[in-house]
């Protein structure tokens, strides 16, 4: 049966046994800045092009054992959530991956900046249709990372990022705090904010909306047909990147402001239990869970 | 306003140095382009001292970025410091990535075209 997260973002009219918009997002290219990925996984094979971009720091620890499957874990799962054959949101979207996170999931602001610059240069050299950039990463507040995101957004690129898994104000982290970026928090099957041990999803005025981010089934890098469940605001951001790709494929001329407005408009409202958030953050945190547009856009979204 | 004349060392007479740590992460805009500021991650464990993004003013051309980077290297060498330019940015933001001692920040902040400098820091998969 349909995984809970895909059911949650699907308008009621399309809630059949299967989530199958056959061509969702086909006009859109989604860039993923993450770990390396297993591009021959059945879920994403032929859908993800691995660029030659790589800018990562060395792994920590003298006894670190580098295993390809572990190096690829985070990125492979997210690529699957965005465009996977069976468990993806925008099954028609094509993706390009850039490696900015090492085998331990760690990167640098400078490496991310160079990655964003690479995307901008690629866009200038070979202009294509709408671009979505997924940044499933977070660091401390960074003026320069936010500025680079702003410039890329002004060039017409849609940036989607994870709010962060620190159970903290997203405004203290980047790129989550960049106003031009669509910042996504994570909710679970009960529409509650995701708890990750003592930590959990970030919140506050820098979050634009929430999306499914707990027990998300997606491609596992353990084998080319394996699946695994992962949790986090990265998974939530991947859902919104997929939804954005579907919307932009249906309406390629949408501006960032219009897209953001549509995302908010079609979200489920006031379903999140705000008691989870600190009292002073409740009024600032949007009570929105992302969803695809309803049947009025049937011909556009499910062509 | 008009920029002051460069002396042989490449410093500007009228540039004011404001070395601020911006601990709260919420930077105020620099005053009328006269003050270059320093920023670093408010979370100490995520800081990567020794690598810095030197961000230049918006309309700076690539050739000026390269020249500014070379000037920093020359001035640093005169003071006995080794530096390495790791990347020159253009296309999104003008500037460059440099590996150098934190002792050189004061010098770097006085370079022409510099808007602000940010110490590199870690980002993590979420």
């Amino acid at each position: 049966s349909i995984p809970w997260n895909l059911e949650r973002i699907t308008p009621p009219r399309y809630r059949a046994d299967e989530y199958q918009p056959p061509d969702g997002g086909s006009l859109v290219e989604v860039y993923l800045l993450d770990t390396s990925i297993q591009s021959d996984h059945r879920e994403i094979e032929g859908r993800v092009m691995v660029t030659d971009f790589e800018n990562v720091p060395e792994e920590d620890g003298t006894r670190f054992h580098r295993q390809a499957s572990k190096c690829d874990s985070h990125g492979t799962h997210l690529a699957g959530v965005v465009s996977g054959r069976d468990a993806g949101v925008a099954k028609g979207a094509s993706m390009r991956s850039l490696r900015v996170l090492n085998c331990q999931g760690k990167g640098t602001v400078s490496g991310t900046l160079i990655g964003l610059e690479f995307i901008r240069k690629s866009q200038l050299v070979q202009p294509v249709g709408p671009l979505v950039v997924l940044l499933p990463l977070a660091g401390g507040y960074s003026r320069v990372l936010n500025a680079a995101c702003q410039r890329l957004a002004r060039a017409g690129v849609v940036l989607v990022t994870a709010a962060g898994n620190f159970r903290d104000d997203a405004c203290l982290y980047s790129p989550a705090s960049a106003p031009e970026v669509i910042t996504v928090g994570a909710t679970n099957a009960q529409d509650q904010p995701v708890t990750l041990g003592t930590l959990g999803t970030n919140f506050g005025r820098c979050v634009d909306l929430f999306a499914p981010g707990e027990d998300i089934i997606g491609a596992s890098s353990d084998c080319s047909t394996c699946f695994v469940s992962q949790s986090g605001t990265s998974q939530a951001a991947a859902h919104v990147a997929g939804i954005a790709a579907m919307m932009l494929s249906a309406e390629p001329e949408l501006t960032l402001a219009e897209l953001r407005q549509r995302l908010i408009h079609f979200s489920a409202k006031d379903v999140i239990n705000e008691a989870w958030f600190p009292e002073d953050q409740r009024v600032l945190t949007p009570n929105l869970v992302a969803a695809l547009p309803p049947s009025t856009h049937e011909n556009l979204y499910f062509q | 306003g008009a920029m002051g004349q460069e002396d042989e060392d490449g410093d500007y007479e009228e540039l004011v140095l404001a070395l601020r740590s911006e601990e709260d992460g919420l930077a105020e805009a620099p005053e009328h382009g006269t003050t270059a500021t320093f920023h670093r991650c408010a979370k100490d464990p995520w800081r990567l001292p020794g690598t810095y993004v030197v961000v230049l003013k918006e309309e700076t051309h690539l050739s000026q970025s390269e020249r500014t980077a070379r000037r920093l290297q020359a001035q640093a060498a005169r003071r006995g410091y080794l530096t390495k330019i790791l990347h020159v940015f253009h296309g999104l933001l003008p500037g460059f990535l440099v590996k150098m001692s934190g002792d050189l920040l004061e010098l770097a902040l006085k370079l022409p075209h510099v808007d602000y400098i940010e110490e590199d820091s870690s980002v993590f998969a979420q």
Epitope: H65, G197, S231 | F124
Partner: antibody, heavy 122, light 110 residues
Framework: QVQLVESGGGVVQPGRSLRLSCAAS????????MHWVRQAPGKGLEWVAL????????YYADSVKGRFTISRDNSKNTLYLQMNSLRAEDTAVYYC???????????????WGHGTTVTVSS | QSVLTQPPSVSAAPGQKVTISCSGS????????VSWYQQLPGTAPKLLIY???KRPSGIPDRFSGSKSGTSATLGITGLQTGDEADYYC???????????FGTGTRVTVL
Amino acid sequence: QVQLVESGGGVVQPGRSLRLSCAASGFTFSSFGMHWVRQAPGKGLEWVALIWNDGSNKYYADSVKGRFTISRDNSKNTLYLQMNSLRAEDTAVYYCARAIAALYYYYGMDVWGHGTTVTVSS
Amino acid sequence: QSVLTQPPSVSAAPGQKVTISCSGSSSNIGNNFVSWYQQLPGTAPKLLIYDYNKRPSGIPDRFSGSKSGTSATLGITGLQTGDEADYYCGTWDSSLSGYVFGTGTRVTVL
């Protein structure tokens, strides 16, 4: 609810081996780093070892390096500590503890077991 | 020998405030996140503070943490008899590539 239960402690002679286990329940075990911490009678806490959530990185205190091995079986939700060449000074209550997150091992430990006692004596 | 130094004991009357210091170096407290733990007599330790000053849910705001340079401080206000316990600071040490605990401080409520 979130729970860690240690087992495998007991009395052992110096030079012998012992394997401690820690059964985790109530949370996604594979998403968290795990620590072993010990406390000698009447003394303070001493960190012993850490393993990352996916087992890719292991760290040890100098006092146990080369003698103790930390491992995990994510399919069984179990953490292990293989203790070889035991010494009298290894006598302690051994706690397993969950790291606050998978990646941010320096955040410390947020869930602790009740401990299992290891006595090394001839 | 612990690399983090705490006072052996502190005491105060009920309702008063106590502070516990934890002194380290740049390789631990100076550049890594500090946590504080409470160990009530005969029980396992419990997390009180992480990331210098954040409290897990369920920990009252009477407990607070701060950091300055290579030292960290735990504050307990409105002291209660139930706060009688041993308190430990802890952090990663980059030089040792390991976690380190403080020497521990016994809090007594007079």
